[in-house]
């Protein structure tokens, strides 16, 4: 009989398609912050705005104390743009005096922290020179890629120098992730 070719033991079970609107996602935007003390070989992490303006967290994706918390395991697209700004005079001072306190490059790192693993994992890193550009310079660094994440993972964005981050507009510096 025709119906017998799809007997229960051979039936494929399809999970119902999940609406995109139900998936965890967040878009965080730049927020003003005062530079804090950090360890010499460790870049400081940025705080983010999570609810005002363009920022939001949805569907159990939460933001707390610099971290974006991953609520369920899966493949996520993670992205961040950080816009830096400064003045070239800082660069000439570096060259002339070898001043260690002003950078000749800027770096952004998206880092994953997993409670079960002792060391943070660098997921993405971007670096640019800042001493080759005009008098008042602006340099955005954009990072984005897909990663397999586990429930409970935490994401943060580290930068080489918080004092150079442009916090003036929420569309210049941002950080987000969404479940694919």
């Amino acid at each position: 009989l025709k119906g017998q070719e799809f007997a229960p033991s051979h039936q494929q079970v399809y999970a119902p398609l999940r609406a995109d609107g139900d998936k965890p996602r967040a878009h965080l935007t730049v927020v003003r912050q005062t530079p804090t003390q950090h360890f010499k070989n460790q870049f400081p992490a940025l705080h983010w705005e999570h609810e005002l303006g363009l920022a939001f967290t949805k569907n159990r994706m939460n933001y707390t104390n610099k971290f974006l918390l991953i609520p369920e395991s899966g493949d996520y697209f993670i992205y961040s743009q950080v816009t830096f700004r400064g003045m070239t005079s800082e660069c000439s001072e570096i060259r002339q005096a070898g001043r260690p306190n002003k950078p000749d490059s800027i770096t952004v790192v998206i880092t994953k922290v997993t409670d079960s693993y002792p060391e943070p994992t660098q997921l993405l890193m971007g670096t640019k020179s800042v001493c080759e550009v005009g008098s008042n310079w602006f340099q955005p660094i954009y990072l984005g890629a897909m990663f397999s994440l586990q429930e409970g993972d935490k994401l943060m964005v580290n930068v080489s120098d918080i004092s150079l981050v442009d916090y003036t507009k929420e569309d210049k510096t941002f950080f987000g992730a969404f479940l694919l």
């Epitope: 927020v31 003003r32 912050q33 005062t34 804090t36 005002l52 303006g53 104390n65």
Partner: antibody, heavy 124, light 107 residues
Framework: QVQLVQSGAEVKKPGASVKVSCKVS????????VHWVRQAPGQGLEWMGV???????DYNSKFQGRVTMTRDTSTNTVYMELSSLRSEDTAVYYC??????????????????WGQGTLVTVSS | DIQMTQSPSSVSASVGDRVTITCRAS??????LAWYQQKPGKSPKLLIY???SLQDGVPSRFSGSGSGTDYTLTISSLQPEDFATYFC?????????FGQGTKLEIK
């Protein structure tokens, strides 16, 4: 760019009410918090209350029961109404958009953007 | 409510002078302090947040310091446009109290 434009000066009699408007541009009142601060002539600044982006309000207990803050999302305007006016309510009333900032792991509020102010004079 | 006490209430100084204004909170505000400048007939302008961070566009002659309950605003070399009234404000909890102001006048 961010702008907050307030309604014009008002003269009111004691016991009356006044309603001051604050029309904003460059942002949405459903996305940012709008506060009201007043300043009596030659005096300091006094926080009155806030219309939170989600539509809730918080008032300074000093004005509780006399102040009402509302908004019209279709015109991106926030209103502050103060009732039972007395002479000591004579002041310039400002609306201001709050900003969040972090120090270490704590966040705080300040006021980077202000309206031009509305003078309310209460006199018999 | 947190009380904010500013001193002095007024100060006279000349162009080029270094001026310091202090603000004391009635309890620890953990550096959650902002400073504003206000000129007659104008709205306040944010100068400093987080006790020591300069708001965008504010000249570097303005600086802030302090922690706990005691905070300071310093203008390193007064310019003619700096003569105004200055207010501190705590941003920790409502009612987000302001200091009573310090009027900076030309000597």
């Amino acid at each position: 760019q961010v702008q907050l434009v307030q309604s014009g000066a008002e003269v009111k009699k004691p016991g009356a009410s006044v309603k001051v408007s604050c029309k904003v541009s460059g942002f949405s009142v459903t996305s940012y918090n709008v506060h009201w601060v007043r300043q009596a002539p030659g005096q300091g600044l006094e926080w009155m209350g806030v219309m939170w982006y989600g539509g809730n309000t918080d008032y300074n207990s000093k004005f509780q029961g006399r102040v009402t803050m509302t908004r019209d999302t279709s015109t991106n305007t926030v209103y502050m109404e103060l009732s039972s006016l007395r002479s000591e309510d004579t002041a310039v009333y400002y609306c201001a958009r709050a900003g969040r900032y972090y120090v270490d792991s704590n966040y705080y509020w300040d006021f980077p953007y202000w309206g031009q102010g509305t003078l309310v004079t209460v006199s018999s | 409510d947190i009380q904010m006490t500013q001193s002095p209430s007024s100060v006279s100084a000349s162009v080029g002078d270094r001026v310091t204004i202090t603000c004391r909170a009635s309890e620890d505000i953990y550096s959650g302090l902002a400073w504003y400048q206000q000129k007659p007939g104008k709205s306040p302008k944010l100068l400093i947040y987080g006790a020591s961070s300069l708001q965008d566009g504010v000249p570097s002659r303005f600086s802030g310091s302090g922690s706990g309950t005691d905070y300071t605003l310093t203008i390193s070399s007064l310019q003619p446009e700096d003569f105004a009234t200055y207010f501190c404000q705590e941003g920790l909890k409502s009612p987000y109290t302001f200091g009573q102001g310090t009027k900076l006048e030309i000597k």
